[in-house]
Interface confidence: low
């Protein structure tokens, strides 16, 4: 057959769906790889063909569209499962072709199981709500196209595995869940379960997301350096280990790039002829404020090292900060010893 433009396995689209639930998967060709849509392709005489490779197999095989109740079907550029089964997991390929043209792409589909509390290996989207600020709404995601607008599904919302009823500041309303003045106690996993009827069959769509209540933009500040500071002096003798923490607080700022770094005599540590180790660690508060620490250590400090200028720097979307560490050589007090000189008198 003719050469086919093979876009390979599109691992950017690692699609995960729940077992025993409907799934509709659009062929990625029209969304990400080709400049035209399915309707244009179809009206130009191109045909969309689907096939798949089962998990842990190499053999490509056609998809069986003759299963009972049309469990798997294709509609325009969408592959439908009504519902999925665990062994539908595999790599799926959609190919657009006619006698002179061919283009195809594969993508992985993983069918995952959930327990009765909606726990599963599913990667969860994260919704961030600003603490103690106004009303935030989240909407049950990825349910468009599953049922016509004439169908009014029932929607039940859960926090963890508890149905949201009479919650202090959380109120479900159909596809939406409203948070009134969000609090840290609202952190957690929220699930909407959409139940609808299609041709006499009941289907459920389960969508879980993580809600994180984060610092408000009004609380955003430039970095604050806890350490080093003016109160602490790093006084060492040559040969001792010098350890200086650069510890910085960053208030939560959406999409802010927080960074800290050391300079030694105005240079990067790598550019200074000193055997330096730097270890970085990060911790987060409940509102995702960040404390970032870089510990600078010199195993055996020399007198020259103790004369250098060590500066901790920090930067976020709100600004920059820097703070020099007070480093000095410990003054060794003189040792008073009694010297008994036995003098041999000269004549």
């Amino acid at each position: 057959s003719e050469r086919c433009d093979d876009w390979g396995l599109d691992t950017m689209r690692q699609i995960q769906v729940f077992e025993d639930e409907p799934a509709r998967i659009k062929c990625p060709l029209f969304e990400h790889f080709l400049k035209y849509n399915y309707s244009t392709a179809h009206s130009s005489g191109l045909t969309l063909i689907w096939y798949w490779t089962r998990q842990d197999r190499d053999l490509e095989e056609p998809i069986n569209f003759r299963l009972p109740e049309n469990r798997i079907s294709k509609e325009k550029d969408v592959l439908w499962f009504r519902p999925t089964l665990l062994n539908d997991t595999g790599n799926y390929t959609c190919m657009l072709r006619n006698t002179t043209y061919c283009s195809k792409v594969a993508f992985p589909l993983e069918v995952v199981q959930k327990d009765s509390c909606f726990n599963s290996p599913m990667r969860l989207p994260v919704h961030r709500l600003y603490i103690e600020q106004g009303i935030h709404n989240i909407t049950c995601p990825n349910v468009d196209g599953y049922f016509p607008s004439s169908v009014k599904p029932s929607v039940t919302w859960y926090k963890g595995c508890t149905e949201i009823v009479n919650f202090h500041n959380v109120q479900p309303k159909g596809m939406n869940l409203s948070f009134f003045i969000p609090l840290v106690s609202n952190n957690g996993n929220y699930t909407c379960v959409v139940t609808y009827l299609e041709n006499g069959r009941l289907f459920h769509l389960t969508r879980t997301m993580t809600v994180k209540v984060v610092g408000s933009p009004k609380d955003a500040v430039p970095p604050h350096i806890y350490s080093p500071n003016d109160r602490v002096v790093y006084e060492k003798e040559p040969g001792e280990e010098l350890v200086i923490p650069c510890k910085v607080y960053f208030s939560f700022i959406m999409d802010s790039h927080n960074e800290i770094w050391w300079t030694i005599d105005g240079k990067k540590p790598d550019d200074v002829p000193v055997d330096i180790t730097i270890i970085e660690s990060v911790s987060y508060s409940s509102t995702e404020d960040e404390t970032r620490t870089q510990i600078l250590s010199i195993k055996k400090v020399t007198p020259e090292d103790l004369k250098r200028n060590y500066v901790c720097h920090a930067r976020n979307a709100e600004g920059e900060a820097e703070q020099a560490a007070k480093v000095k050589q410990k003054v060794i007090p003189p040792r008073y010893t009694v010297e008994l000189a036995c003098g041999f008198g000269a004549t």
Partner: antibody
């Protein structure tokens, strides 16, 4: 504790009417589909009807369509079954049952049942 | 409507026995199947939902399996309290149909 308690059963003549009630407590009634299931003496179980959380959808077994009406009052946490044009084959214990798992259609809590006898 | 066929209709067994009850659907119902236990004069009690999920509080000697059209309820070691009627029920489609029941009696 989840509880469902049926009432309203009794003896009725063929062609007559009867209204069954089910009082629910111990759970958020308005969040659940509810069903009626019946069992004729010495026979198996038969699902009769169910109703969506907000009452906007109702389904019936073919044998009762047009004769039975399921309804609910969420404020009173009550479920009802209005039965008319009753026949001898409607004689059964009628159970009120809560549908579990978001209205999937299996029944996780049942009442103890109320007996309806259709006889002349 | 989907027909649910249970077998056997009566089963005689002894305490300690392993018992299997089967249920067949007239067409595929995926995993939309529940099992119930009913004792004389009592309401049915849910044992298994979604073909294999054990309802909370139900002893682990009860287990369910199957998907599509063939399902089984297994009692691994019969206890005196297990002698009762058992029903399967499909809930993939309206109407929600029950099997005709299996009466489990003491041998």
């Amino acid at each position: 504790e989840v509880q469902v308690v049926e009432s309203g059963g009794g003896l009725v003549q063929p062609g007559g009417s009867l209204r069954l009630s089910c009082a629910a407590s111990g759970f958020t009634f308005r969040s659940y589909w509810m069903s009626w299931v019946r069992q004729a003496p010495g026979k198996g179980l038969e699902w009769v009807a169910n109703i969506k959380q907000d009452g906007s959808e109702r389904h019936y077994v073919d044998s009762v369509k047009g004769r039975f009406t399921i309804s609910r009052d969420n404020a009173k946490t009550s479920l009802y079954l209005q039965m008319s044009s009753l026949r001898a084959e409607d004689t059964a214990v009628y159970y009120c049952a809560r549908e579990g798992y978001f209205g999937s259609g299996y029944f996780d809590y049942w009442g103890q049942g109320t007996l309806v006898t259709v006889s002349s | 409507d989907i027909q649910m066929t249970q077998s056997p209709s009566t089963l005689s067994a002894s305490v300690g026995d392993r018992v299997i009850i089967t249920c067949r659907a007239s067409q595929s119902i995926s995993r939309g199947l529940a099992w119930y236990q009913q004792k004389p004069g009592k309401a049915p009690k849910l044992l298994i939902y979604k073909a294999s999920n054990l309802e909370s509080g139900v002893p682990s000697r009860f287990s369910g399996s199957g998907s599509g059209t063939e399902f089984t309820l297994t009692i691994s070691s019969l206890q005196p309290d297990d002698f009762a009627a058992y029903y399967c029920q499909q809930y993939s489609y309206y109407s929600h149909t029950f099997g005709q029941g299996t009466k489990l009696e003491i041998k």
